[in-house]
């Protein structure tokens, strides 16, 4: 069945997304499968449902089990299952395999380690990073947004990296940690001045007022692993984070590599409930690497 494994540590926050995705307007009901008991939506509960998300604030070992989410459209009900396991905190430094997220590989040119699942949480920078339980110190390590960059990667940088951050829910803070292995590989490649594939410069996109729309900024930076390759959106020349409009959210950049070996990154700007004032903004797609910065501008117009 449509099922997803999720895990966490006791006394930490855990947020799980329903594996059955639907449109944002669809209702999502959550149940504890063993008892068929409905999960409450009131935020005063330690475990509560919030649309597509199931929140354990904080999690307890007894929360382990299978949770059912039913996504309801006007004519279809679709079911997903979240298999949740909450573990006791380890007394020593060792992080067991069952608490590890997917392994990532890096090279001298590309040493980004993303903090797993962080996009589900309401967190603020900076992240804390640990390698084999030791806090990372020194200028080689740069905590940037939701990832860690290591300068001049060497083979002994391989190991288990843990990110630690604070999730905030209605003024209360909860700790979250996530660990993944990092391996180092030797890779031949090259980097170029960024090439923006989309949008075209000075493009205009037609949108419906009141509807949702997505803008994709897609750029390529060369072949093979890239040391620095950033794709982001700006609004009227300002960072999205500085633009206090919760309807407009930028997704974490998704790495993409094509059959021709080009290393590209896509970053999506999601605009919910498009308003007239959004048509007045200038949307800049920025692609930056060590060679320089390229900018393409797109504007919105009413359909």
């Amino acid at each position: 069945k449509f099922s997803k494994q999720s895990w966490g540590l006791e006394n930490e926050a855990l947020i799980v997304r329903c594996p059955r995705q639907g449109k944002s307007s669809y209702i999502v009901d959550w149940y504890y499968s063993q008892t068929n008991k409905s999960i409450p939506t009131q935020e005063r509960n330690r475990v509560f449902a919030s649309g597509q998300l199931l929140k354990f604030l904080p999690a307890e070992v007894a929360d382990s089990g299978i949770y059912t989410c039913i996504v309801r459209s006007p004519t279809f009900n679709r079911t997903g299952y979240a298999n949740v396991t909450i573990y006791k905190k380890q007394p020593d430094c060792n992080v067991p395999d069952y608490l590890m997220y997917s392994t990532v590989s890096g090279s001298e040119k590309n040493s980004k380690i993303y903090c797993p699942t962080i996009d589900l949480y309401n967190w603020t920078a900076p992240l804390e990073w640990f390698k084999n339980c030791q806090a990372l110190q020194g200028s080689r390590y740069k905590a940037h947004k939701s990832f860690l960059v290591i300068d001049n990667v060497m083979t002994d940088d391989a190991g288990d990296y843990t990110c630690k951050f604070i999730h905030n829910e209605n003024g209360a803070n909860y700790s979250v940690t996530a660990t993944r292995s990092f391996t180092v590989k030797d890779e031949q490649g090259f980097s170029l001045f960024p090439v923006i594939r989309a949008p075209a410069h000075n493009e205009t996109k037609e949108v419906e007022i009141g509807e949702n729309t997505n803008l994709t900024c897609s750029a390529c930076f060369g072949k093979g692993a890239q040391f620095l390759a950033t794709v982001q959106w700006q609004l009227n020349g300002n960072k999205i984070t500085d633009f206090s409009e919760p309807r407009i959210q930028q997704e974490e950049g998704q790495n993409q590599s094509f059959s021709n070996g080009l290393a590209c990154v896509n970053t999506v700007l999601r605009i919910a409930d498009v308003k007239e004032e959004d048509l007045l903004l200038r949307y800049d797609c920025l692609a930056l690497n060590l060679h320089g910065l390229r900018r393409h501008t797109i504007r919105l117009s009413r359909k």
Epitope: K1, F2, Q21, G22, K23, S73, T75, F76, R78, T79, E208, E211, T213, N214, T216
Partner: antibody
Framework: EVQLLESGGGLVQPGGSLRLSCAAS????????MIWVRQAPGKGLEWVSY????????YYADSVKGRFTISRDNSKNTLYLQMNSLRAEDTAVYYC????????????????WGQGTLVTVSS | EIVLTQSPATLSLSPGERATLSCRAS??????LAWYQQKPGQAPRLLIY???NRATGIPARFSGSGSGTDFTLTISSLEPEDFAVYYC????????FGQGTKVEIK
């Protein structure tokens, strides 16, 4: 009531072009992905092309890639299929159908279908 | 692409009998599988989605089961209007249809 009505089929010579239309009513057209499916005479169903609700995502079956173009005009509640470089094996009844769930770029079932329009490619 | 193989190609049964139709996928499609009914000169009609859920207005005699690569459509007691061609469709990776099973009157 949801209704889909295809038009634009007919007889065309190999190498020729045809544009199919599908007029939709009874639902918020821009909310849903739309799909073209075809059925050669006496044969099974073959998926042809997909377009997301806002028109930003399109997919094609390998058999039509580079020759067919799917598009939509949400202001007119109309779906299109531009068919170029037509071949004898494109002869089929072409159905437009609604994918009522699909988030942009994903697929689901087809809950409403048009009655189909026949395309015959022959010299 | 994911290939769906339906069996048997033809099923000859009498009204009131139980019909069991099979659909096998070349790789796992989780439960992203649907069943359709098509009568001559008509467009297909959705019966089952997500392998086992009946679409709105579909009689209870139609049921679906399976997950992964092996799926079954069961018609518990055939009515005269059930004699038609049945197609399975996967939507896990793009869309593909099976080649169809014809249920005909014996």
């Amino acid at each position: 009531e949801v209704q889909l009505l295809e038009s634009g089929g007919g007889l065309v010579q190999p190498g020729g072009s045809l544009r199919l239309s599908c007029a939709a009513s009874g639902f918020t057209f821009s909310d849903d992905a739309m799909i073209w499916v075809r059925q050669a005479p006496g044969k099974g169903l073959e998926w042809v092309s997909y377009i997301g609700g806002n028109g930003g995502t399109t997919y094609y079956a390998d058999s039509v890639k580079g020759r067919f173009t799917i598009s939509r005009d949400n202001s007119k509640n109309t779906l299109y299929l531009q068919m170029n470089s037509l071949r004898a094996e494109d002869t089929a009844v072409y159905y437009c159908a609604r994918d009522p769930w699909s988030t942009e770029g994903s697929f689901f079932v087809l809950d409403y279908w048009g009655q189909g329009t026949l395309v015959t490619v022959s010299s | 692409e994911i290939v769906l193989t339906q069996s048997p190609a033809t099923l000859s049964l009498s009204p009131g009998e139980r019909a069991t139709l099979s659909c096998r996928a070349s790789q796992s499609v989780d439960d992203d599988l649907a069943w359709y009914q098509q009568k001559p000169g008509q467009a297909p009609r959705l019966l089952i989605y997500d392998a086992s859920n009946r679409a709105t207005g579909i009689p209870a005699r139609f049921s679906g089961s399976g997950s992964g690569t092996d799926f079954t459509l069961t018609i518990s007691s055939l009515e005269p209007e059930d004699f038609a061609v049945y197609y399975c469709q996967q939507y896990n990776d793009a869309i593909t249809f099976g080649q169809g099973t014809k249920v005909e009157i014996k």
